[in-house]
């Protein structure tokens, strides 16, 4: 059996982990709540350093953050699989690691969007990562809530596969999105969304060159590279995919 | 400065306990509960290995499998010191016990540590 949290005071609800933690959403339950750099050790996984960020709604775990432009995220398969980036600063975690803080279980999915005049947009998935076999497929398992899920991601219970300029898996027969645009992501038809694109600072004339930004079609529109993004996760309690 | 000074080795037999201290001083460690703490050790000719380690708030004690069961990490924030309870210690214990502290939340890894204390010996001989 696998190792749990042991209580110490039941009165309070406290308990106490003898072990690294296998994700932040373990941290936060055991009373850790002060977001920052930890070393977790999913099940059957050598440890490694997460950026945990407590909220609310529990610990999640940063898997994705650009705001300077200051790491290159156009870069092949095993450096997406593996990870690449400062943890303090822009960072990819790894879908690896991902996928092994997920395991087989739903996922709630936040990603955080800022434009250059200031306006945040949140918004919430839940979805199943596949591992390597599946070159990561993404499904989502339920609707999206809100205005902007319906054009932004592939309708519920389809898979899109990870794609990197050197692993051309997206949905297109015609082109490799990864190749055509920048960085690795789950490209379906390429038009979407890309939040490991080419980070701007300013917005350059030439559309051919504007489409490899980092864009999230149905928040400010395909041609719009966006100033900082986040993308959090946080797998969901026991149930395990479908 | 920060400092990190660690006290309670010795000479123990085979089955024997020993309590291992840690002081933290310096105007860093006035917050000395934003601070992770761990214990390594170092056997002769060996490298440095990882014992246990507790988070700022306490509730996260990771231990090395070596270790589980027989030694226990805890932290008195308030008085600035770490502690390393010790018990059936066995032969293969013996080594120069180190007190660190990490800015990371919780680790396991030597390299996750940026404060070191100059070590205790423990040394466990019938």
């Known amino acids: 059996l696998p190792e749990m949290a042991q209580p110490v005071d039941p009165a309070h609800n406290v308990s106490r982990l003898h072990r690294l933690p296998r994700d932040c959403q373990e941290l936060f339950q055991v009373g850790e709540r002060q977001s920052g750099l930890f070393e977790i050790q999913p099940q059957g996984s050598p440890p490694f350093l997460v950026n945990c960020k407590m909220t609310s709604d529990g610990g999640w775990t940063v898997i994705q953050r650009r705001h300077d432009g200051s790491v290159d995220f156009n870069r092949p398969w095993e450096a997406y699989k593996a990870g690449f980036g400062d943890p303090h600063g822009e960072f990819w975690l790894g879908l690896e690691k991902v996928h092994s803080i997920t395991g087989d279980r739903n996922s709630r999915l936040a990603v955080q969007l800022r434009d250059w005049d200031g306006n945040a947009e949140l918004l919430q998935f839940s979805v199943h990562l596949g591992g390597e076999d599946t070159a990561y497929s993404l499904q989502l398992t339920a609707p999206v809530a809100g205005q902007l899920g319906a054009t932004t991601v592939p309708p519920s219970g389809l898979s899109v596969p990870f794609s990197t300029w050197d692993q051309d898996h997206d949905l297109r027969r015609d082109k490799n999105c990864a190749k055509s645009l920048s960085g690795g992501w789950w490209f379906g038809t390429c038009s979407h969304s890309n939040l490991n694109g080419q980070y701007f600072r300013s917005i350059p004339q030439q559309r051919q060159k504007l489409k490899k930004g980092i864009f999230w079609k149905t928040w400010r529109g395909r041609y719009y590279p966006l100033q900082a993004t986040t993308m959090l996760i946080q797998p969901m309690a026991a149930e395990a995919a479908s | 400065e920060v400092q990190l000074v660690e006290s309670g080795g010795g000479l123990v037999q085979p089955g024997g306990s020993l309590r291992l201290s840690c002081a933290a001083s310096g105007r860093t460690f006035s917050t000395f509960n934003t601070y992770s703490m761990g214990w390594f050790r170092q056997a002769p000719g060996k490298e440095r290995e990882f014992v246990a380690a507790i988070s700022r708030s306490g509730n996260v004690t990771p231990y090395a499998d070596s270790v589980k069961g027989r030694f226990a990490i805890s932290r008195d924030n308030a008085k600035n010191t770490l502690t390393l309870q010790m018990n059936s210690l066995k032969p293969e214990d013996t080594a120069v016990y180190y007190c660190?502290?990490?800015?990371?939340?919780?680790?396991?890894?030597?390299?996750?540590?940026?404060?070191w204390g100059q070590g205790t010996q423990v040394t466990v001989s019938s």
């Open positions: 660190a502290a990490s800015k990371i939340g919780i680790a396991s890894t030597i390299r996750y540590y940026d404060y």
